[in-house]
């Protein structure tokens, strides 16, 4: 028979309050005959945690059937973990003795420490929108975790970011810790549909990291481009002028027509369409009455986007003599 070894594979076991902790212990030999007991701590003051032979341990159950003759697994489960349960646990083999069993060999011990899961990461973007090519900052926060070791990563559309700074507080010993990270992201014109993700990995999460997200649509403003055109065809005595407002975000937009500097109050037809990249196009049609006394008409399409300074485009209406003639002919 090989000499008996006591195997406690985990040096550290992180447990959560209220959960069940499993402390592993196996032996490599059935000999010498004698019980395996569990203790917390060492020396004369050690606390008996489990003794199969005698005592009442309502929170402790064995993983294996200890009554089986060939059993070599003496692992235990402790239910309803509280902060008072932290410490180093030893499985100890006793050899039969008379009148008392004699301690034979101890396992190396497993330290049980309280682990607390981090809270779901919260990602906050900038207070105000910014235009493409500029840099914006996002912050990610997670709280209440223990132990202190934690990993945080940033992603934009699945691509890992490198421009960020992370702090874990406090720096000294604590029951629980917090993490705060700030990432700098350069905005692209197509970022309306983009997402930034803050990913937090911690030993208590068992390889399943927590993620917090923020949509760049909340942080970006894509200013519109304007184009005013006159339609070649006229309808009766009216000429159709179009103002195309392209590639803007967000949707918030005010469009006004001016005729020779005078704001027009009358209804105009318009359509709003969404582009694949999440930006919008707005098309507005303005009908201008053509008469003899109107030789030079300047139309202005003015757009106020998302509370910014208004931008405008002007068009000098081209009305040919032929068009005028047709117009006067058409008027009864």
């Amino acid at each position: 028979e090989e000499e008996l070894q006591m195997i406690q594979p985990e040096k550290l076991l992180l447990v959560t309050v209220g959960k069940t902790a499993t402390l592993h212990c196996t032996v490599t030999s059935l000999l010498p005959v004698g019980p395996v007991l569990w203790f917390r701590g060492v020396g004369p003051g050690r606390e008996l945690i489990y003794n199969q032979k005698e005592g009442h341990f309502p929170r402790v159950t064995t993983v294996s059937d200890l009554t089986k003759r060939n059993n070599m697994d003496f692992s235990i489960r402790i239910s309803s973990i509280t902060p008072a349960d932290v410490g180093t646990y030893y499985c100890v083999k006793f050899r039969k003795g008379s009148p008392e069993n004699v301690e034979f060999k101890s396992g190396p011990g497993t330290e049980m420490a309280l682990g607390a899961k981090p809270s779901a990461p919260v990602v906050l973007g900038p207070a105000a929108r910014t235009t493409p090519e500029h840099t914006v900052s996002f912050t990610c926060e997670s709280h209440g975790f223990s132990p202190r070791d934690i990993t945080l990563k940033w992603f934009k559309n699945g691509n890992e970011l490198s421009d960020f700074q992370t702090n874990v507080d406090p720096t000294g010993q604590s029951v629980a810790y917090s993490i705060r990270s700030t990432a700098r992201v350069v905005l692209d014109p197509w970022d309306v549909r983009s997402q930034v993700i803050c990913e937090v990995a911690h030993v208590t999460l068992q390889g399943d990291p927590l993620r917090g997200t923020a949509n760049l649509s909340e942080a970006i403003r894509v200013p519109p481009t304007l184009e005013v055109t006159q339609q070649p065809m006229r309808v009766g005595n009216q000429v159709n002028v179009t103002c195309q407002v392209r590639k803007f975000y967000p949707q918030s937009l005010q469009l006004t027509w001016s005729e020779n500097g005078n704001v027009c109050q009358r209804e105009t037809a318009s359509t709003l369409t969404e582009n694949k990249d999440g930006t919008y196009n707005w098309t507005s049609w303005f009908l201008v009455n053509i008469s003899d006394q109107r030789d030079d008409v300047v139309l202005t399409c003015q757009v106020k986007h998302d509370g910014q300074l208004a931008v405008s485009k002007r068009l000098a209406l081209e009305v040919t003599v032929h068009q005028k003639d047709q117009s006067s002919d058409a008027t009864p």
């Epitope: 019980p35 059937d65 089986k68 003759r69």
Partner: antibody, heavy 124, light 106 residues
Framework: QVQLQQWGAGLLKPSETLSLTCAVY????????WNWIRQPPGKGLEWIGE???????NYNPSLKSRVIISVDTSKNQFSLKLSSVTAADTAVYYC??????????????????WGQGTTVTVSA | SYELTQSPSVSVSPGQTASITCSGD?????YAWWYQQKPGQSPVLVI????KRPSGIPERFSGSNSGNTATLTISGTQAMDEADYYC?????????FGGGTKLTVL
């Protein structure tokens, strides 16, 4: 304390299957291993195997290929079947209990109560 | 496989002490049991876990086990103690019996 009463066919022909049953009276059926031991005429004791209430078995390696020990907890009985018997299987067969209760560990319990024994003869 | 060896016979005068030995490799690391069997009867457990007596077994029966040898001692042997005695131990979930010792009370 537990008491054991055993029965089964006493005379067998070679190649037949020996079948014995042991009834348990008193005690908690779930805190024991239940054993079968045999003793050929004029010789010593030979352990055949054991079973507990959940059906966990251990067998003597020399007999393992021919032995089945089963348990019927509803009747508080356990049984032995030994197949393909020969004259060498002629013996007194005993059932015995091993009490482990709640305060024991592996190999700390032996055979504390024995049945009255059943003489089995294998002859052509 | 594990083996337990007993001397086939021991003789003792009434009132004297009889010692029956059982040897096996590192037997002291295991528990030893002792059974008494009288002619035509079922075995009876007389010592369990090396040195413990079941209720109903007289105090003159005692046991010890260390090294490679377990010993059953009967002090003040009586004629009624004449019987076959078997030691037993466990090896890898298998019960192993010694060959038995016939105790004769002269």
């Amino acid at each position: 304390q537990v008491q054991l009463q055993q029965w089964g066919a006493g005379l067998l022909k070679p190649s037949e299957t020996l079948s014995l049953t042991c009834a348990v009276y008193g005690g908690s059926f779930s805190t024991y291993y239940w054993n079968w031991i045999r003793q050929p005429p004029g010789k010593g004791l030979e352990w055949i195997g054991e079973i507990n209430h959940s059906g966990s078995t251990n067998y003597n390696p020399s007999l393992k290929s021919r032995v089945i020990i089963s348990v019927d907890t509803s009747k508080n009985q356990f049984s032995l079947k030994l197949s393909s018997v020969t004259a060498a299987d002629t013996a007194v067969y005993y059932c015995a209990s091993s009490h482990y209760g709640s305060g024991s560990f592996p190999d700390s319990y032996g055979m504390d109560v024995w049945g009255q024994g059943t003489t089995v003869t294998v002859s052509a | 496989s594990y083996e337990l060896t007993q001397s086939p016979s021991v003789s003792v005068s009434p009132g004297q002490t009889a010692s029956i030995t059982c040897s096996g490799d590192k037997l002291g690391d295991r528990y030893a049991w002792w059974y008494q069997q009288k002619p035509g009867q079922s075995p009876v457990l007389v010592i369990y876990q090396d040195d413990k007596r079941p209720s109903g077994i007289p105090e003159r029966f005692s046991g010890s086990n260390s090294g490679n040898t377990a010993t059953l001692t009967i002090s003040g042997t009586q004629a009624m103690d004449e019987a076959d005695y078997y030691c037993q131990a466990w090896d890898s979930s298998t019960a192993v019996f010694g060959g038995g010792t016939k105790l004769t009370v002269l």
